[in-house]
């Protein structure tokens, strides 16, 4: 169940895809990645108010229990629902290789 | 990549499975669920310090960028890695039915 996409906190405040520019140094990859030198990292950032983009039944339960016990149960969290692959040119024992990482760039977000 | 399971914040402080007891009223289910009357909800709660139970490359990136830009990029979040099914006896238009929910109870946790 993918619930409401209307953010009650105001435009852009709720869970959505953001792009953060990062260098290989920022990522701690400079010693093993040759390319790309800079990555447009897409990630899921934002609040998860009641039933906003609830990923599943568990997220709905979490919302209900957070409302009841906010000190014990955290609100649902904005995380990737799916990913885009990314290809890196990386150093290997024998030289250099292309490697696809399927879980590197967020493609879509939900609350869980 | 499922990284270190050692919690640097002290025992039980990092992302792990917790059990929260909840009634049908707590969950907002009283009008459509007959049984169970009380649910032992297993959910993922706790901090996600650097590389602790990192779910994938995305989580590792998030850790690195959170360290660099804590106001922009949140730390990884403790969420279910897998679920246990749960069977509810629920009301239907025609009476009562058994229904299995595959995404209700967290079974295992990771940081993402």
């Amino acid at each position: 169940a993918r619930n409401g996409d209307h953010c009650p906190l105001g435009p852009g405040r709720c869970c959505r895809l953001h792009t953060v520019r990062a260098s290989l140094e920022d990522l701690g990859w400079a010693d093993w990645v040759l390319s790309p030198r800079e990555v447009q990292v897409t990630m899921c950032i934002g609040a998860c108010p009641s039933q906003f983009r609830a990923a599943n039944m568990h997220a709905q339960i979490k919302t209900s229990l957070h409302r009841l016990k906010p000190d014990t149960v955290p609100a649902p969290c904005c995380v990737p629902a799916s990913y885009n692959p990314m290809v890196l040119i990386q150093k290997t024992d024998t030289g250099v290789s292309l490697q696809t990482y399927d879980d590197l760039l967020a493609k879509d977000c939900h609350c869980i | 990549a499922r990284n270190g399971d050692h919690c640097p914040l002290g025992p039980g402080r990092c992302c792990r499975l917790h059990t929260v007891r909840a009634s049908l009223e707590d969950l907002g289910w009283a009008d459509w669920v007959l049984s169970p009357r009380e649910v032992q909800v297993t959910m993922c709660i706790g901090a996600c310090p650097s590389q602790f139970r990192a779910a994938n490359m995305h989580a590792q990136i998030k850790t690195s960028l959170h360290r660099l830009k804590p106001d922009t990029v949140p730390a990884p979040c403790c969420v279910p890695a897998s679920y246990n099914p749960m069977v509810l006896i629920q009301k239907t238009d025609t009476g009562v039915s058994l229904q299995t929910y595959d995404d209700l109870l967290a079974k295992d946790c990771h940081c993402i």
């Epitope: 040759l34 390319s35 790309p36 030198r37 885009n84 692959p85 990314m86 290809v87 890196l88 040119i89 290997t92 024992d93 024998t94 030289g95 250099v96 290789s97 292309l98 490697q99 696809t100 760039l105 | -």
Partner: antibody
Framework: EVQLLESGGGLVQPGGSLRLSCAVS????????MTWVRQAPGKGLEWIGI???????YYASWAKGRFTISRDNSKNTVYLQMNSLRAEDTAVYFC???????????????WGQGTLVTVSS | DIVMTQSPATLSVSPGERATLSCQAS??????LAWFQQKPGQPPRLLIY???TLASGIPARFSGSGSGTEFTLTISSLQSEDFAVYFC????????????FGQGTKVEIK
């Protein structure tokens, strides 16, 4: 000695299929990326695609769907399967070790001598 | 799709002179670029990789420079064996990976 030897070329009719082989010796295929390149008579070089050491494949956009790169590590051989061949696919087909824009350790320039594919009726 | 554009198509140079060949990428390819020399009936020979690193066994008169989208191959003093066709190859990676050669520059004797 480290070597690459292409085979499987020849005359094929338009619409036909052909599988080229690149037999390698002197190194383990699973440790290296392998690239296929072609060159039409009197023309420039054309990048076809790569199979990585981990088995992922990457293709030029024009090659996607018609050309497939695979490998058999036990036979130390890389393959280029070509389908729905057209006259403009007539070329010498080369295999080469590595991704070419960066050097592998050791031999920096390992290419086969090429195999000629002629598509004609 | 990545497109590599070489210029000029033909370069007429006298032996002993300097030759400068250009290659432009349609995408930012960082230093994912190599230069090859090819003579008739032979496979290409790697001269420069990573945009500026001289391949083993290649004379020091060959040098490469550039990054991003603009690249140059320089032959400081042309020898008779340097008259050949030169190709650049770029590889672009992001959500996938794709390579492309430039159309080639023929270096001929003036």
């Amino acid at each position: 000695e480290v070597q690459l030897l292409e085979s499987g070329g020849g005359l094929v009719q338009p619409g036909g299929s052909l599988r080229l082989s690149c037999a390698v010796s002197g190194f383990s295929l699973s440790s290296y990326d392998m690239t296929w390149v072609r060159q039409a008579p009197g023309k420039g070089l054309e990048w076809i695609g790569i199979i990585s050491g981990s088995g992922n494949t990457y293709y030029a956009s024009w090659a996607k769907g018609r050309f497939t790169i695979s490998r058999d590590n036990s036979k130390n051989t890389v393959y280029l399967q070509m389908n729905s061949l057209r006259a403009e696919d007539t070329a010498v087909y080369f295999c080469a070790r590595g991704i070419l824009v960066y050097a592998d350790y050791g031999d920096h320039n390992l290419w086969g001598q090429g195999t000629l594919v002629t598509v004609s009726s | 799709d990545i497109v590599m554009t070489q210029s000029p198509a033909t370069l007429s140079v006298s032996p002993g002179e300097r030759a400068t060949l250009s290659c432009q990428a349609s995408e930012d390819i960082y230093t994912n670029l190599a230069w090859f020399q090819q003579k008739p009936g032979q496979p290409p020979r790697l001269l420069i990789y990573a945009a500026s690193t001289l391949a083993s066994g290649i004379p020091a008169r060959f040098s490469g420079s550039g990054s991003g989208t603009e690249f140059t191959l320089t032959i400081s003093s042309l020898q008779s064996e340097d008259f050949a066709v030169y190709f650049c190859l770029g590889v672009y990676t992001y959500i996938s990976a794709e390579g492309a050669f430039g159309q080639g520059t023929k270096v001929e004797i003036k």
